[in-house]
Interface confidence: low
Amino acid sequence: PEPPTACREKQYLINSQCCSLCQPGQKLVSDCTEFTETECLPCGESEFLDTWNRETHCHQHKYCDPNLGLRVQQKGTSETDTICTCEEGWHCTSEACESCVLHRSCSPGFGVKQIATGVSDTICEPCPVGFFSNVSSAFEKCHPWTSCETKDLVVQQAGTNKTDVVCGPQDRLRA
């Protein structure tokens, strides 16, 4: 028969014949021959391969370097890489999470729309009319202005996006 020019899924073409790929978690030791099947070996400790492959070396698990504020979120297996995340109060600078930076704080006049996580920074939003924030914080939302009416008081000083309203007593009716 004619030698194949293409192989089935999970196979590869070598020396005019189709050999089985190694399964995830294993690396290639030797190609198949006319008489022998592909020889594969499991990846060693702290190594992985995450696809059907013909790699002769497994990849090293990512190292979550404490020097960079990283810690292990999910330990790697022979088929998956280690996933790193940042220490509390920090977030990754990239999707690959290779280093960490401090969570940003929302300035006065802005409140926290979304609290930061190990992989995303704080999202701030301007305080809309009727709300204020007088602190720089990575956690505080905009607070609603105090309702003077419910306290039987009147507004003596209007609120802003950075300050609450100031309430005061109602003027007595003059005779």
Epitope: P66, G69, W90, S99
Partner: antibody, heavy 128, light 104 residues
Framework: QVQLQQSGPGLVKPSQTLSLTCAIS??????????WNWIRQSPSRDLEWLGR?????????DYVGSVKSRIIINPDTSNNQFSLQLNSVTPEDTAIYYC??????????????????WGQGTTVTVSS | EIVLTQSPATLSLSPGERATLSCRAS??????LAWYQQKPGQAPRLLIY???NRATGIPARFSGSGSGTDFTLTISSLEPEDFAVYYC??????FGPGTKVDIK
Amino acid sequence: QVQLQQSGPGLVKPSQTLSLTCAISGDSVSSNSATWNWIRQSPSRDLEWLGRTYYRSKWYRDYVGSVKSRIIINPDTSNNQFSLQLNSVTPEDTAIYYCTRAQWLGGDYPYYYSMDVWGQGTTVTVSS
Amino acid sequence: EIVLTQSPATLSLSPGERATLSCRASQSVSSYLAWYQQKPGQAPRLLIYDASNRATGIPARFSGSGSGTDFTLTISSLEPEDFAVYYCQQRSNTFGPGTKVDIK
């Protein structure tokens, strides 16, 4: 004020085990914001980091490749200290050995640990 | 492995003079570089971290600069106690070979 006090023999015979201890005062070996390191300085003045231990909800240890097969760094929480064990020593292991604390000191950049506290150093000679 | 090279190996200067020490990395280390000072019979002492930040208690005459592969430690006006060996160190904890600053 954090201090590191080293102890251990100054003379070790070839093929034997070098054992040093570093007692910590003013901080905890179980701190989750520090790493505890051993460094040596050869007679030629070169500084070589040997390894570290640190606690981040569990204990971790990292070693430099050149001594990985014969080094052990262990924390001792009950005595608030950590130790260095270097097996099968040769005269090339003759050096001044230092223990250090490394921690994040602030700054505008991603987390990076600097060695801000050092032990007094122990001169170790490997000779028969 | 990232290799650090320091130059010059020895710097001979007089008190009051300006000292400029160089540290070069074989590949980028971003700003992850520290400088240490070591006097005879003493352990090294941290001077500068994150390339340009002075450690606690370090006089203002010491300053660090640079990023990527080229870094500089500057001592603006040498005091008698500044004559010592200076080492740079990058984040994988490897050190440079040192620069000795001695009295001319």
